[in-house]
């Protein structure tokens, strides 16, 4: 699951994982 950047109830920032694929596979060899 991807989280979005924002402020949670304990005032900690939520790291945005949205720059990375959720279930990545290896790049196809060409």
């Amino acid at each position: 699951s991807e989280t979005t950047t924002g402020t949670s109830s304990n005032s900690s920032q939520s790291t945005s994982n949205s720059g990375l694929a959720p279930n990545p596979t290896n790049a196809t060899t060409k």
């Epitope: 699951s1 989280t3 950047t5 949670s8 304990n10 900690s12 920032q13 939520s14 790291t15 945005s16 994982n17 949205s18 720059g19 990375l20 694929a21 959720p22 990545p24 596979t25 290896n26 790049a27 196809t28 060409k30």
Partner: antibody
């Protein structure tokens, strides 16, 4: 304020080991996918390893160049991610950054592998 | 591995003028969920990198709107509408669609 603070770098001989730590604060660490990225002096960025969160079964991924030698782990109770580096080579010499999925970055810790 | 190729290698820009950096990937970055995991990062002199943009065009919090990202599949562009002195550094594109994550070689932006 979000802070990632790396430690554990230093000078080590080829074949030796080091364990890097990255302590996070100001961030919901348990939700973060944590990565290590390195940068040799005057060079570009190279991804090293990643560990995902509990909902993703703490799955780990590694660059081919470190697979079998480096191990990434995390302790959510301490908001800390680790990189155990074994069988170090001279080409592993670099500044090692920890980053929350490329979002927040630490200041880096220098690892020098030399005899 | 997906190879990320950035051009130009360096860029000298007058303050207030626009700047553009190109990033091309050796394979499509379009992921099966319809999203494209292309990021832009800036490493200012003596500092650690900082992400500016994720998923091609989404600005990270606190990033000025003079920065914009565009592109699809294999061709991407970072644009700065009006360069400011604080924008100097090395800009990297990075793909997060297929393992291993890979970075472009960087584009050094300096003030003319």
């Amino acid at each position: 304020e979000v802070q990632f603070v790396e430690s554990g770098g230093g000078l080590v001989q080829p074949g030796g080991s080091l364990k890097l730590s990255c302590a996070a604060s100001g961030v919901t660490f348990s939700e973060a996918w944590m990565d290590w990225v390195r940068q040799a002096s005057g060079k570009g960025l190279e991804w090293v390893a990643e560990i995902r969160d509990k909902p993703n079964s703490y799955v780990t991924y590694y660059a081919e160049s470190v697979k079998g030698r480096f191990t990434i782990s995390r302790d959510d109770s301490k908001s800390t991610v680790y990189l155990q580096m074994n069988s170090l080579k001279t080409e592993d010499t670099a500044i090692y950054y920890c980053t929350g999925a490329m979002d927040y970055w630490g200041q880096g810790t220098l690892v020098t592998v030399s005899s | 591995d997906i190879v990320m190729t950035q051009t130009p290698l360096s860029l000298s820009v007058t303050i207030g003028q626009p700047a553009s950096i190109s990033c091309k990937s050796s394979q499509s970055l379009l992921y099966s969920n319809g999203k494209t995991y292309l990021n832009w990062l800036l490493q200012k002199p003596g500092q650690s990198p900082k992400r500016l943009i994720y998923q091609v065009s989404k600005l990270d919090p606190g990033i000025p709107d003079r920065f914009s990202g565009s592109g699809s599949e294999t061709d991407f562009t970072l644009k700065i509408s009006r360069v400011e002195a604080e924008d100097v550094g090395i800009y990297y594109c990075m793909q997060g669609s297929s393992l291993p994550w890979t970075f472009g070689g960087g584009t050094k932006v300096e003030i003319k």
